[in-house]
């Protein structure tokens, strides 16, 4: 038994252009937390295993708020170590999966929203009881710096925490009823002494006098990073004389990387860059499986159908993202029309409508006309949530209650006299003029300049009474039409008001649930 310990030193934008300024979205402040998952790295059964060695979740880091125009600082991180206890032997070779999560603290209905910022997956060799191993990993535009170690918990000792030890003073046999604790050492042993000068940071040993290097380091004392080797770029078997590599077939020939991984050459070897969900030397191991519970917010995890994904998350209502980590801001799509207030209840969306509107998305315009009908034969016109009256001639104002003087604007031309009438106005034209507004001059021979135009009505014209009779019939027809329209509107509004009362009751119940 023992404990794997992970210390995050820094998480922030990586070097180079296009690096993000802030981990937070535009919606406001956020804070970071980390998840670590450990898997044994050699056995074939690890391919579909959960975090078999254990997993841990860090505390939340301090709240981070981006300062506009300020240089991006080191992001505030959670305090303390991430500790993953392991019950059995430490496997030595293992896979380390570190996820950096962002918790958004903006005004989220239903609580904070999480999103996965970065995931690094590395296969590592590490002896228990050794020094801290440091690492820097890139994940997209982010860079993560961390240290890790595995340590045994007494009485377990050794590089795999499999040997048990006891102090000299302890009795040499197990107590009555207990089976032997083999292999039991005579005393607590010190870890093996490595070769003199072996790097404490990048080397370790399982036998006294040896110096074995962690991944990324080479040389007899594990002091040389592999990327600075003078033989970089050369291929083939090792030369015994120079220690350099001589040309030969490329390690990436035939692409040894499985599951769509891409191969890049390293001195004398190769490295696979694996697609999401896979890891291992050849991307042959599925990194995160459904048994790890990768779907947040209760999402249903299903084994991926295509080779590029180890799993697919089917999200609960109100969540999205490859891990169901994003709360769906469905109100940002402005589904409520006519100024309605959008409420995202998590599992459903509700619109609280402004007065005069109804329907699931406030799409029905009740327009208030029925409640405040237009007077004096005015017609109500719907639109924009505010009713508008188109008034009959001779009336004006918001509800057509004010009597208008149609002659106030002096509409009769060429000295014609204006008479206000319930159906509008009538111009009595001066001699020599004709037309509805006395706009046409009459020629000396009695022919109008526009013979098609009807003559203006003068007081005493025999046509006048007939025209007025026609107008009266038209007005009566309009008034009758308005009465029918108002009655039908009242019925329709009553129906929607009933529906709206029911909907508001439901909404109140849901919000209180």
């Amino acid at each position: 038994a023992g404990v794997f310990e992970l210390q995050i030193h820094s998480f922030g934008p990586g070097p180079g252009p296009g690096a993000p300024r802030s981990p937070c979205s535009a919606r406001g402040p956020c804070r970071l937390f980390f998840r670590v998952c450990l898997k044994p790295g050699l056995s074939e059964e690890a391919a579909e295993s959960p975090c078999a060695l254990g997993a841990a979740l860090s505390a939340r880091g301090p709240v981070y708020t981006e300062q506009p125009e300020a240089p991006a600082p080191d992001l505030p991180l959670p305090n303390g170590l991430l500790q993953v206890p392991f019950r059995d032997a430490w496997p030595g070779t293992f896979s380390l999966i570190i996820e950096t999560w962002r918790e958004e603290l903006g005004d989220q209905i239903g609580g904070p929203a999480w999103s996965l910022l970065a995931r690094v997956t590395r296969r590592r060799r590490l002896a228990a009881g050794g020094p801290w191993a440091r690492d820097i990993q890139r994940a997209g535009a982010w860079e993560l710096r961390f240290s890790y170690r595995a340590r045994c918990e007494l009485p377990a000792v050794g590089t795999a925490c499999t040997r048990l030890c006891r102090p000299r003073s302890a009795p040499s046999r197990c107590g009555p009823g207990l089976r032997p604790c083999a292999p039991l050492e005579d005393e607590c042993e010190a870890p093996p002494v490595c070769r003199a000068g072996c790097s404490l940071e990048h080397g370790f040993c399982e036998q006294p006098g040896e110096c074995r290097c962690l991944e990324g380091w080479t040389g007899p004392l594990c002091m040389v990073p592999v990327s600075t080797s003078s033989c970089l770029g050369l291929r083939g078997p090792s030369s015994t004389t120079t220690g350099c590599l001589v040309p030969g077939p490329g390690p990436c020939d035939g692409n040894p990387c499985a599951n769509g991984g891409s191969c890049s050459e390293t001195p004398g070897s190769f490295e696979c860059t694996c697609p999401r969900g896979f890891y291992g030397l050849r991307c042959e191991v599925s990194g995160v499986t459904c048994a790890d519970g990768p779907c947040f917010n209760g999402g249903l995890c299903v084994g991926g159908a295509d080779p590029d994904s180890a799993y697919i998350c089917h999200c609960p209502p109100g969540f999205q993202g490859s891990n169901c980590e994003k709360r769906v801001d469905r109100c940002s799509l402005q589904p409520c029309r006519n100024g309605g207030l959008c409420l995202d209840l998590g599992h459903a969306l509700r619109c609280r409508c402004r007065a005069g509107f109804a329907g699931p998305r406030c799409e029905h315009d009740l327009d208030d006309c029925a409640g405040r009908a237009c007077a004096n034969g005015g017609t109500c016109v719907e639109g924009g949530g505010a009713h508008r009256c188109s008034c009959a001639l001779g009336f004006g104002g918001r509800n057509c209650r004010e009597r208008a003087d149609p002659c106030a604007a002096r509409p009769c031309a060429h000295g014609g006299r204006c008479y206000a009438h319930f159906s509008g106005l009538v111009c009595a034209c001066a001699p020599g003029y004709m037309g509805a507004r006395c706009e046409f001059p009459v020629h000396p021979d009695g022919v109008s300049a526009l013979p098609a135009a009807p003559p203006g009505l003068r007081p005493g014209d025999p046509q006048r009474a007939g025209v007025i009779a026609v107008i009266v019939v038209v007005v009566i027809a309009i008034v009758a039409g308005i009465v029918v329209l108002v009655i039908s509107r009242k019925k329709r509004m009553a129906k929607y008001e009933k529906a709206e009362i029911k909907e508001m009751g439901e909404m109140h119940r849901e919000l209180n649930a």
């Epitope: 048994a291 779907c295 209760g298 609960p316 459903a348």
Partner: antibody, heavy 117, light 107 residues
Framework: EVQLVESGGGLVKPGGSLRLSCAAS????????MNWVRQAPGKGLEWVGQ??????????HYAESVKGRFTISREDSKNTVYLQMNSLKTEDTAVYYC????????WGQGTTVTVSS | NIVLTQSPATLSLSPGERATLSCKAS??????VSWFQQKPGQSPRLLIY???NRYTGIPARFSGSGSGTDFTLTISSLEPEDFAVYYC?????????FGGGTKVEIK
Amino acid sequence: EVQLVESGGGLVKPGGSLRLSCAASGITFSNFWMNWVRQAPGKGLEWVGQIRLKSDDYATHYAESVKGRFTISREDSKNTVYLQMNSLKTEDTAVYYCTTGYYFDYWGQGTTVTVSS
Amino acid sequence: NIVLTQSPATLSLSPGERATLSCKASENVGTYVSWFQQKPGQSPRLLIYGASNRYTGIPARFSGSGSGTDFTLTISSLEPEDFAVYYCGQFYSFPSTFGGGTKVEIK
């Protein structure tokens, strides 16, 4: 292989208490929402309650029929979720299952609770 | 709570026949419907999620369809091991609710 194993069921008198346990293996337990669902004899399924994750402050939700009487808790270090049932009624007689997630993907084999005088 | 009504209550069929089970919701639940199979003395098992998606390891003879308020589970050709009780469940509105079940028995 994912396994959920319920225990703690038995015969209890009305008004009595019982504590059910559900031990999980084969999954990273701390990442899963856990639910209790029950099935009265010869009847259908009824959701009882749910507990979420540490990152959700172990939020719990309950069916109206058990609210105030039943309490769900979890111990991630032991891969175990519990259902504490108090003030039991005869209508609580059922097989109790623990299930995972929002969609009840993994199920235990169930434990029988009989409330009778 | 949303009420799910399953029909028929019992379906008597022979192996090899096609089974069609219905589930109606009291209100719109989108496609947030799952189907579960329960054999005597066993726990329920998830078959279909999201109205029409087969869960991991479920044979292709099981298919689901529908959206809104009307949903159907179809077993294209009944195998002896398919005779069981089938429940629909809605996951659109919290709390989740189940239908009363349809028993598929051997004729």
